[in-house]
């Protein structure tokens, strides 16, 4: 029987800068029941606080609700593991909520084949930002990435769309059915999951007009 091994806070995520959750990985338990507590203080403060919510994020997590979440302030946190034989502490983790946003996927993905008479035909893709993200304040810049592939293909073709919410793709295989998805990330933050796939049938006459 031994004191617990050193835990590690390995991930923190926020859906929208208004709440966030951090997760830790326990060390060895030393063969004894082990209790974990996360404590934190904000940059420039000395007063330590305990995690406000160990439930919402699931096992080995701490959730910070709206009233505990401040933007532009660094949180300095650590996890304490304690059993009958002693304690061990994780390294301190410095967290700025502005940098840990992982948004929901973009919404309203629409895909259409456009065949103008005087120009090469193209696939037109359009989407909307996720609803929880407030782009009007200027706090967020969202970047987008599109992926598409013929239904039976193994490899995805990926296009970076920057900040725009629509995109044109010219080179496609006529007669094929394509899957299209889009995802987004803040300029400092994490990629969302891919949106649900939208299917589009490319016409057999999808060729450059003379």
């Amino acid at each position: 029987q031994l004191p617990p091994g050193k835990p590690e806070i390995f991930k923190c995520r926020s859906p929208n800068k208004e709440t966030f959750t951090c997760w830790w990985r326990p060390g060895t338990d030393g063969g004894l029941p082990t209790n974990y507590s996360l404590t934190y203080h904000r940059e420039g403060e000395t007063l330590m606080h305990e995690c406000p919510d160990y439930i919402t994020g699931g096992p080995n997590s701490c959730h910070f609700g709206k009233q505990y979440t401040s933007m532009w302030r660094t949180y300095i946190m650590m996890v304490n593991a304690t059993n009958q034989m002693g304690s061990s502490f994780s390294d301190e983790l410095y967290v700025d909520v502005t940098y840990i946003v992982q948004p929901d996927p973009p919404l309203e993905l629409a895909v259409e084949v456009k065949q103008p008479e005087d120009r090469k035909p193209y696939l037109w893709i359009k989407w909307s930002p996720p609803t929880l993200i407030d782009l009007k304040t200027g706090w967020f810049t969202l970047l987008y990435e599109i992926r598409l592939k013929p239904e039976k293909a193994a490899e995805w073709e990926i296009h970076f769309a920057g900040q725009q919410t629509e995109f044109k793709i010219l080179s496609l295989h006529p007669g094929q059915k394509y899957l299209v998805q889009v995802r987004c990330k803040p300029d400092h933050g994490y990629w969302s999951a891919w949106s649900p796939a939208t299917f589009i049938q490319i016409p057999s006459d999808f060729t450059m007009n003379d």
């Epitope: 991930k11 940059e43 410095y94 940098y99 994490y190």
Partner: antibody, heavy 120, light 107 residues
């Protein structure tokens, strides 16, 4: 204990490429951005670029955008910096540096440095 | 790019002296400034982040004041292990940039 261990010194010819590695241990590699910084002999520090090991998303100093490539191998917790079209002024010590936290770009852990000498 | 201008480029001082190093940013950077210490043949070591917050384990004799464009690193009572070169760094906008360094030498 957090450690960043870099590959050994390199001597390269002008026009060639060099690839420096940085093996991370003592923490979850995918949690923190990794940066690359260089220091020419007797000079200051110059930031090359940064990479998020969780998804390989990277940002570069425009000065190096066309010549530097940052990559990671998650299976071995190793970051790489490749610099192409080397010239004599690229002679420097190249450092990998781990982001201090999940936040802005200040650097709490540094590799020991890799001296790259470019000489004909 | 934001230029970070450090002064002086070198300073001679004795153990117990108060030493101040200044760093001036060419544009507003808020408090997005860090300070590092580097000894010959070694990697830089983080001292201060967000302009005024000492990193874990850094002695209290190191402090920073300033925000906006003007920053000052103060060593309140110089110790033998403090003789080194000090760099400031801004992380307000890409590319992250460093000052040219200030060498603190033994008088």
């Amino acid at each position: 204990e957090v450690q960043l261990v870099q590959s050994g010194a390199e001597v390269k010819k002008p026009g060639s490429s060099v690839k420096v590695s940085c093996k991370a241990s003592g923490y979850t590699f995918t949690t923190y951005w990794m940066h690359w910084v260089r220091q020419a002999p007797g000079q200051g520090l110059e930031w090359i670029g940064e990479i998020d090991p969780s998804d390989s998303y990277s940002n570069y100093n425009q000065k190096f955008k066309d010549r530097a490539t940052l990559t990671v191998d998650k299976s071995t917790s190793t970051a790489y910096m490749e610099l192409s079209s080397l010239r004599s002024e690229d002679t420097a010590v190249y450092y990998c540096a781990r982001n201090g936290g999940l936040g802005p770009a200040w650097f709490s852990y540094w590799g020991q440095g890799t001296l790259v000498t470019v000489s004909s | 790019d934001i230029q970070m201008t450090q002064s002086p480029s070198s300073v001679s001082a004795s153990v117990g002296d108060r030493v101040t190093i200044t760093c001036k940013a060419s544009q507003y950077v808020g408090t997005a400034v860090a300070w590092y210490q580097q000894k010959p043949g070694k990697s830089p070591k983080l001292l201060i982040y967000s302009a005024s917050n000492r990193y874990t384990g850094v002695p209290s004799r190191f402090s920073d004041s300033g925000s906006g464009t003007d920053f000052t690193l103060t060593i309140s009572s110089l110790q033998p292990e403090d003789f080194a070169t000090y760099f400031c760094q801004q992380y307000s906008s890409y590319p992250w940039t460093f000052g040219g360094g200030t060498k603190v030498e033994i008088k």
